[in-house]
Interface confidence: low
């Protein structure tokens, strides 16, 4: 992960950042952690985003102060109420959108002092793949499918047996827009597999990389995906 | 599941120190603060201090300042709060807590008894 | 330090109505109030934080109002296994403090 640390200010208090990705459509975390203090009611949580005008969010003697927010996050924010006197001032997206890709500032006031990080937020779309035996196929074929990716990823087939084998000629991959036309249902097939191997799927972009592993033997199928999501360069 | 389990109940001499650990699941423990909570038989709640891990941070009720010292050990995923210079009224049930602004989970509580 | 005192010290009510406490404080808390039941034996359980947010597990009968310095739980129908004693606490400010509980009984 790749962490910020921010000080600012003569009394000046450490308060730490960490990149991080958001799916479109769900929910998204933006991460920041402070030096806690002793009383709720001395700490203000702001939350700013380059570009915008209004505040992102702002949380103050224990409660929400949403009278500044900026009309692009209304409805869509909060902080871990019950976290933030142990130092926790972590922002929930809800509905995350492209456009809420940017640079970040979580910005603190305690009666310690004041500080503030940046974060990197991006954004798109990254789902698990599943890969089966495609029993419809005249050969022996493995199909890898993961419903929803933006930007497009790139995919590449691997196997356990056939190490540093290229298996782009005997694959075909194609991309279908999902009806929200941004992201897009990864199809993937391999053909010619051999029995008691192993296969691998996986599939990355530049904010996730997610493989699926599929175990053909003669008497069972084993599956096992991972999704991984990628840092982001220290700016 | 959360859980919070302390040690088992003690009974000590006026003037002794006691020692009560409360060891967490690690996801709680790194996540959470951890507070004492203790309650003299009859009586209500008083809370003693609490500690952050993951900050290694601690605070202490005034009253208690001086003579109760809580510390964390990351490794074990345990709380202790140890407490010198007993004296009877410190006979009370000793609870670990999560949480440092309300307390969502508690340990069974350990019985401390102070009497000659 | 904030001064929490819970009203009436006992109160008793019959079942399947509605049981009402109070809670004051010395000083606003606004909304950083939470509620604990604890029965004879057993740790106290979380029943609303926030003044008026339930606790995973709470039924709905519990209720939460307030905020500054008056606050109140309400149990709309007592059930049987409601008998207990019931905590306020404020977490605004340190120390954090409780009030002195409310023992619920059946009339």
């Known amino acids: 992960l790749i962490i910020g640390f921010g000080i600012s200010g003569r009394h000046s208090i450490t308060v730490t950042t960490v990149a991080s990705a958001g799916n479109i459509g769900e929910d998204g975390i933006l991460s920041c952690t402070f030096e806690p203090d002793i009383k709720l009611s001395d700490i203000v949580i702001q939350w700013l985003k380059e570009g915008v005008l209004g505040l992102v969010h702002e949380f103050k003697e224990g409660k929400d102060e949403l009278s500044e927010q900026d009309e692009m996050f209304r409805g869509r924010t909060a902080v871990f109420a019950d976290q933030v006197i142990v130092g926790n001032a972590s922002l929930r997206l809800k509905n995350v959108q492209l456009t809420d890709a940017g640079t970040y500032k979580c910005y603190i006031i305690t009666s310690k002092g004041k500080g503030n990080a940046n974060l990197e937020y991006k954004t798109g779309a990254f789902s698990m793949p599943e890969v089966n035996v495609d029993y419809n196929a005249s050969s022996e074929t493995l199909r890898c499918e993961a419903p929803r990716w933006f930007p497009q990823p790139t995919v590449v087939w691997a196997s356990q047996v056939d190490q540093g084998a290229n298996f782009s000629e005997v694959s075909n991959t194609s991309f279908e827009l999902n009806s929200e036309n941004v992201t897009m249902k990864v199809v993937s097939v391999l053909y010619n597999v051999t029995i008691n191997n192993t296969y691998s799927c996986m599939i990355e972009n530049d904010i996730a990389k997610a493989t699926g592993d599929i175990k053909v033997t003669e008497s069972e199928i084993k599956r096992r995906s991972h999704l991984q999501l990628l840092n982001s360069k220290a700016s | 599941q959360v859980q919070l389990v302390q040690s088992g109940a003690e009974v000590k001499k006026p003037g002794s120190s006691m020692r009560v650990s409360c060891k967490a699941s690690?996801?709680?423990?790194?996540?959470?603060?951890i507070s004492w909570v203790r309650q003299a038989p009859g009586q209500g709640l008083e809370w003693m201090g609490g500690?952050?891990?993951?900050?290694?941070?601690?605070n202490y009720a005034q009253k208690f300042q001086g003579r109760v010292t809580i510390t964390a050990d990351k490794s074990t995923s345990t709380a202790y709060m140890e407490l010198s210079s007993l004296r009877s009224e410190d006979t009370a049930v000793y609870y670990c807590?999560?949480?440092?602004?309300?307390?969502?989970?508690w340990g069974q509580g350990t019985l401390v008894t102070v009497s000659s | 330090d904030i001064q929490l005192t819970q009203s009436p010290a006992t109160l008793s009510v019959s079942p399947g109505e509605r049981a009402t406490l109070s809670c004051r404080a010395s000083?606003?808390?606004?909304?950083?109030l939470a509620w604990y039941q604890q029965k004879p034996g057993q740790a106290p359980r979380l029943l609303i934080y926030?003044?008026?947010i339930r606790a995973t597990g709470i039924p709905a009968r519990f209720s939460g109002s307030g905020s500054g310095t008056e606050f109140t739980l309400t149990i709309s129908s007592l059930q049987s296994e409601d008998i207990a004693t019931y905590y306020c606490?404020?977490?605004?400010?340190?120390?954090?403090?409780f009030g002195q509980g409310t023992r619920l009984e059946i009339k």
């Open positions: 807590a999560r949480g440092g602004p309300y307390f969502d989970y």
């Open positions: 690690e996801d709680t423990f790194s996540s959470y603060a």
């Open positions: 500690t952050a891990p993951i900050f290694g941070t601690t």
């Open positions: 000083q606003s808390v606004s909304s950083n």
């Open positions: 926030g003044d008026y």
């Open positions: 606490q404020q977490y605004v400010d340190l120390p954090i403090t």
